[in-house]
């Protein structure tokens, strides 16, 4: 007898994991055998779709590999033409083990700023997210919070927040761990110990001390009166993210010394500065009788001529004595290019010692003139011919007025080493005695006006003169 369809096994809710099998059963009793159709969210399932399997005349519908998108309401409808069609529905809930879709990444952050480590997850049931720092679960506090999204937010990042982090996503089906990431906390450069100001006597040695910290460890540079320090020695050491820099100075003039600590944060730099003043006891601005100060020679032209670290007199009648006197020497040396090979080294020695006179430090720095004997040795022995030309140019006013120092020294006005050996400066480069000089042919027709002294011997001779050179 014909019998209208009756669903004997109504559909139930099916839970399935992604990639698993899910089966709905819709057992039907009827005669004749019914046509069974299936829908998902009221859309007909095509039975030739290879993602599905149909068994037992449509009474079993199997999804062979569940996807996220399969979630929904499934209904089976049975109809055999006898009575009305019957329907039963059930839900497919696609369950999913936790999956971290946006894992955290390594972060570099400056102390005091806000850091956010992402951890976006998927899963059904919705996973709960927690974080591990190092090997221990991370505790939330007023600064540290796990957001609804799973991301970790750290307000006012501190140095101690640095370390290795990973997020953990958990639901009833399993647990997923992110890879371990590094939170690096960078700290602006900061000076821990500033250099101290000193009031010292002229010619003292002073050590300025500057200590700085930061992450990364900063570098320290020293500035003297606005320029990079050119003299003095710097010693540095680094320990536990602290850099210690010591600048040792030989004090010949007052100055402002600045310690600058710098470190880099990405493309930007942070700096910290601290300054110290060096003043010289009883130092005052040059008076009428105090026309300059002593300082180490820092130029280039006279480097080979003047003794290393020589204290020279800098004339404060110039705005910038060092630069002005260097320019004078430079200009004069260019004039010397045309003189004879015998004259030139002697003239250079005389010129450098005349323009950059040796300096006697003290309450009133005093220039020490060249000894007359050395001046005469250059004038009448080595450079007789050239000297005449230079004197003539000076008298005819061929040198500009500001070049008055270029006027060759008047040897007769210079102190003699016989009067007071400490009152004048010697030219160590002229290491010739009378015996050497006698081998030279006569330099002029006139007799030297004074007896050429025995010049002191020096091991640092910067030139030698062969007797075969002609002076004419």
């Amino acid at each position: 007898l014909p019998k209208a369809p009756v669903i004997t096994t109504p559909l139930e809710t099916v839970d399935a994991l992604v990639e698993e099998v899910a089966t709905f059963m819709c057992a039907v009793e009827s005669y004749p055998q019914p046509e069974i159709s299936w829908t998902r969210n009221k859309i007909l399932i095509k039975l030739f779709d290879t993602r599905y399997s149909i068994r037992e005349n449509g009474q079993l519908l199997t999804i062979l590999s569940v996807e996220d998108s399969d979630d929904g309401i499934y209904c089976c409808t049975a109809n055999n033409g006898v009575g009305g069609a019957v329907e039963s529905c059930g839900a497919l809930q696609v369950k999913m083990k936790p999956k971290i879709t946006r894992p955290p990444i390594n972060v570099k952050i400056i102390e005091g700023l806000k850091a956010v480590l992402p951890c976006t997850t998927m899963g059904n049931p919705k996973p709960s997210v927690s974080w591990i720092k190092g090997d221990s679960p991370l505790r939330e506090n007023s600064r540290i919070a796990v957001l609804e999204s799973g991301s970790l937010r750290i307000h006012n990042v501190q140095k101690e927040d640095a370390g290795q982090y990973r997020c953990v996503a958990k639901n009833s089906l399993g647990t997923a761990y992110s890879k371990v990431v590094k939170l690096e906390v960078e700290v602006f450069a900061r000076i821990l110990r500033a250099p101290e100001s000193h009031n010292v006597t002229f010619g003292s040695f002073v050590t300025l001390h500057c200590t700085a910290t930061g992450i990364p460890v900063p570098t320290i540079t020293w500035i003297e009166n606005g320029n990079a320090v050119s003299s003095g020695s710097i010693q540095e050491s680094v320990k536990d993210r602290v850099i210690d820099s010591r600048l040792q100075l030989f004090i010949t003039k007052p100055g402002l010394y600045t310690c600058i600590a710098t470190n880099k944060h990405g493309e930007k730099f942070s700096t910290a500065k601290a300054a110290a003043t060096i003043s010289i006891a009883e130092w005052s601005k040059p008076q009428k009788d105090n026309k300059g100060y002593c300082a180490q020679y820092r130029g280039e032209v006279c480097n080979a001529v003047l003794a290393k670290d020589a204290l020279v007199f800098l004339n404060t009648s110039y705005a910038d004595p060092e630069e002005a006197q260097e320019l004078l020497v430079h200009t004069a040396w260019n004039e010397l290019k045309v003189v004879s090979p015998v004259c030139r080294p002697a003239a250079e020695a005389l010129l450098c010692n005349h323009i950059f006179q040796e300096c006697s430090p003290g309450v009133v720095p005093t220039p020490i003139p060249i000894c007359r004997e050395y001046c005469l040795a250059v004038k009448e022995l080595f450079c007789a011919k050239e000297w005449l030309v230079m004197e003539e140019k000076t008298h005819r006013g061929l040198y500009r007025s500001e070049m008055h120092l270029l006027s060759v020294p008047e040897c007769s006005k210079l102190p003699s080493m016989h009067w007071d050996p400490t009152a004048c400066a010697r030219l160590p480069h002229l290491d010739y005695n009378k015996e050497n000089l006698k081998t030279f042919p006569p330099m002029t027709s006139s007799k030297p006006s004074v007896d050429i002294p025995n010049l002191p011997s020096s091991s640092s001779s910067s030139f030698s003169v062969s007797p075969t050179y002609s002076m004419t």
Partner: antibody, heavy 121, light 107 residues
Framework: EVQLVESGGGLVKPGGSLRLSCAAS????????MAWVRQAPGKGLEWVSS????????YYADSLKGRFTISRDNAKNSLYLQMNSLRAEDTAVYYC??????????????WGQGTLVTVSS | DIQMTQSPSSLSASVGDRVTITCRAS??????VNWYQQKPGKAPKLLIY???TLQSGVPSRFSGSGSGTDFTLTISSLQPEDFATYYC?????????FGQGTKLEIK
């Protein structure tokens, strides 16, 4: 009474072919899904293949796909298994079974006595 | 494929003992599990279907339970004719799979 009788087993060389048959009686064959299940000597049961009553739905065990073919002739109430490229590991007793929709899922409620297939050189 | 893992693989027991065999599925399969008994040289016989329903003609000492992934076959009081090999089978997927079997022997 449901009856299933297998035939066609025997000795075959590796690489050879064999066709098994199953004669069914005592039930509406054309309305029933039929299956082959095998059992290697001293081993467990292994489902091989199933075919729906109208032959529209056919399934094979993944490991056998491409070498075995299930078919049926409802007019003759017969089920067949064509086995090609036979290997030593195909040596087993092959059972013909009727699949039946149960309260949940399907089960094999009737079995034949089995036919032995030996693949050996 | 859905794997069915049966334990133990063999079991020695005496007549009158209560025996339990378990079967675990590799994914949730609702109650789509059947149990079979096979004696040496014979074809398997359906004992229990839909995880817990006794096939007609099967003695009531046999019972089945479980849902999801874990299933159990229990023989409340072993009889001499119960010494055989038992198999679980899933039909949740159309690619049917059996457990590897549990051989029940007389102690």
């Amino acid at each position: 009474e449901v009856q299933l009788v297998e035939s066609g087993g025997g000795l075959v060389k590796p690489g050879g072919s064999l066709r098994l048959s199953c004669a069914a009686s005592g039930f509406t064959f054309s309305a029933s899904t039929m299956a082959w299940v095998r059992q290697a000597p001293g081993k467990g049961l292994e489902w091989v293949s199933s075919v729906s009553g109208d032959s529209h739905h056919i399934y094979y065990a993944d490991s056998l796909k491409g070498r075995f073919t299930i078919s049926r002739d409802n007019a003759k109430n017969s089920l067949y298994l064509q086995m090609n490229s036979l290997r030593a590991e195909d040596t087993a007793v092959y059972y013909c079974a009727r699949e039946r929709l149960l309260r949940l899922g399907v089960g094999f409620d009737s079995w034949g006595q089995g036919t032995l297939v030996t693949v050996s050189s | 494929d859905i794997q069915m893992t049966q334990s133990p693989s063999s079991l020695s027991a005496s007549v009158g003992d209560r025996v339990t065999i378990t079967c675990r599925a590799s994914q949730r399969i609702s109650g789509f599990v059947n149990w079979y008994q096979q004696k040496p040289g014979k074809a398997p016989k359906l004992l229990i279907y839909a995880a817990s329903t006794l096939q007609s003609g099967v003695p009531s000492r046999f019972s089945g339970s479980g849902s999801g992934t874990d299933f159990t076959l229990t023989i409340s009081s072993l009889q001499p004719e119960d010494f055989a090999t038992y198999y679980c089978q899933q039909s949740y997927s159309p690619l049917y799979t059996f457990g590897q079997g549990t051989k029940l022997e007389i102690k």
